[in-house]
């Protein structure tokens, strides 16, 4: 793989010695801003493992709503609009990282904490086990 | 006004920088350890909107890999592992908070940032414009 | 650029229905990094958030729970507007009424575009 | 339900002179979506910040604000005429859960 050159003075992320706790400058930047990015807004309805977006509600953690995908068949529409169960829906699961209160109550300690999403679905040639 | 008693346990945030910075344990935990999500390592080969996972390395940035799925093709594979240009791959796009290091190379001083990223791709059927 | 107009009876009677429209232009009521809101202003309540619609996949409506038994907010979507219905008005309910886009990003949330708003007295 | 107070609920202040208007929410709330507007006399509320530190669009930079947890605050660097208004802030911890202070005016002194 690629290999980038590490500042020696900086620990590394995935090293024991890497800092626990680190001050946070909270005013957010946007690495997105002078893109566009094609909203996928439609895509849970387009697309042939379509899905339904539901409300995951936390007020405790940041961001407090995350939408989470979940597909709605087992199987992929085809091209007649039925759904072919010889294809499977999949969700497409991706880590992100929320900011939770720790201790709680405490207006400017926080913990970082590692979650589990559905963005989206896709369809997938299923695996296919034979019986010996 | 309301009087808030502050918790004696909480860092203080009497920083001249306060209250933009605070502090973050980045000992991550991680909300999904019980679970056992069935990977999705595979569906990107496996999809009818096949995706190929770039490396994203940024060693100022917490996490500093992150993998960036790219649509194979711009249509979709058919049953017959041919490319159908009458449907489109497209990319599932998520928005992520990561952290960088501010000022950069220094190992304890952070800001949250806000980054787009493609999870993966999903088969939408196209939005035909009409010419009147 | 997004432009929201109101319309509506500016005089309601005691135990009657408020009906308001708001009309959206340059912006799509079923758009999936909005929501649409009504919040009301009165000299005894201040600034008051009563509910809002949003669509994602499906239509979600959110009511404050001190109207959350009186209100339906509901979308239109083939005139790209929503209405707000406040069943059994008092007196109380006396107010200037806005509609406003509430930006839903998930990472923020705040009212960027307001209706010129609309003054309904509930009187007989 | 959050109560958000605003103090001074006036400030009586001269063009030229910096105004710091605070909020304080009764319980925690995440400066992401902490808000304040401007209203003048027969108009609708304009959003000035999101947030909490975050100037709108078309906002001039004497405009910025700050805070986290409960303690939030305004401030005008040097107060032109037409910043003479009403100003509230508004807070977002759930999607039941929205509310505006009950609003700070600046006056000329």
């Known amino acids: 793989g690629i290999t980038i050159p590490r500042n020696p003075g900086c620990p590394n992320s995935e090293d024991k010695n890497f800092p626990r706790t680190v001050m946070v400058n909270l005013n957010i930047h946007n690495r997105n801003t002078n893109t566009n990015p094609k909203r996928s807004s439609d895509y849970y309805n387009r697309s042939t493992s379509p899905w339904n977006l539901h409300r995951n509600e936390d007020p405790e953690r940041y961001p407090s709503v995350i939408w989470e995908a979940q597909c709605r068949h087992l199987g992929c529409i085809n091209a007649d609009g039925n759904v072919d169960y010889h294809m499977n829906s999949v969700p497409i699961q991706q880590e992100i990282l929320v900011l939770r209160r720790e201790p709680p109550h405490c207006p400017n300690s926080f913990r970082l904490e590692k979650i589990l999403v559905s963005v989206g679905c896709t369809c997938v040639t299923p695996i296919v086990h034979h019986v010996q | 006004g309301i009087t808030i008693p502050r918790n004696p346990g909480c860092p203080n945030s009497e920083d001249k920088n306060f209250p933009r910075t605070v502090m973050v344990n980045l000992n991550i935990h991680n909300r999904n350890t019980n679970t056992n999500p069935k990977r999705s390592s595979d569906y990107y080969n496996r999809s009818t909107s096949p995706w190929n996972l770039h490396r994203n390395e940024d060693p100022e940035r917490y996490p500093s890999v992150i993998w960036e799925a790219q649509c194979r093709h711009l249509g979709c594979i058919n049953a017959d592992g041919n490319v159908d240009y009458h449907m489109n791959s497209v990319p599932i796009q998520q928005e992520i908070l990561v952290l960088r290091r501010e000022p950069p190379h220094c190992p304890n001083s952070f800001r949250l940032e806000k980054i787009l990223v493609s999870v993966g791709c999903t088969c939408v059927t196209p939005i035909v414009h009409h010419v009147q | 650029q997004v432009q929201l107009q109101q319309s509506g009876p500016g005089l309601v009677k005691p135990s009657q229905t408020l009906s308001l429209t708001c009309a959206i232009s340059?912006?799509?009521?079923?758009?999936?990094?909005?929501?649409w809101g009504w919040i009301r202003q009165s000299p005894s309540r201040g600034l008051e958030w009563l509910g809002r619609i949003s669509y994602r996949s499906k239509w979600y409506n959110d009511y404050a729970v001190s109207v959350k038994s009186r209100i339906t907010i509901n979308p239109d979507t083939s005139k790209n507007q929503f209405s707000l219905q406040l069943n059994s008005v008092t007196p109380e309910d006396t107010a200037v009424y806005y509609c406003?886009?509430?930006?839903?990003?998930?990472?923020?949330?705040?009212?960027?575009?307001w209706g010129q708003g609309t003054l309904v007295t509930v009187s007989s | 339900e959050i109560v958000l107070t605003q103090s001074p609920a006036t400030l009586s202040l001269s063009p030229g002179e910096r105004a710091t208007l605070s909020c304080r929410a009764s319980?925690?709330?995440?400066?992401?979506?902490l808000a304040w507007y401007q209203q003048k006399p027969g108009q609708a509320p304009r959003l000035l910040i999101y947030?909490?530190?975050n100037r709108a669009t078309g906002i001039p930079a004497r405009f910025s604000g700050s805070g986290s947890g409960t303690d939030f605050t305004l401030t005008i660097s040097s107060l032109e005429p037409e910043d003479f208004a009403v100003y509230y802030c508004?807070?977002?911890?759930?999607?039941?859960?929205?509310?505006f202070g009950q609003g700070t005016k600046v006056e000329i002194k």
């Open positions: 406003a886009r509430e930006v839903d990003s998930m990472y923020y949330s705040y009212f960027d575009i």
């Open positions: 319980q925690n709330v995440w400066a992401f979506y």
């Open positions: 947030g909490a530190s």
């Open positions: 508004q807070q977002y911890r759930s999607t039941l859960s929205l509310t």
């Open positions: 340059g912006d799509s009521v079923s758009s999936s990094s909005a929501a």
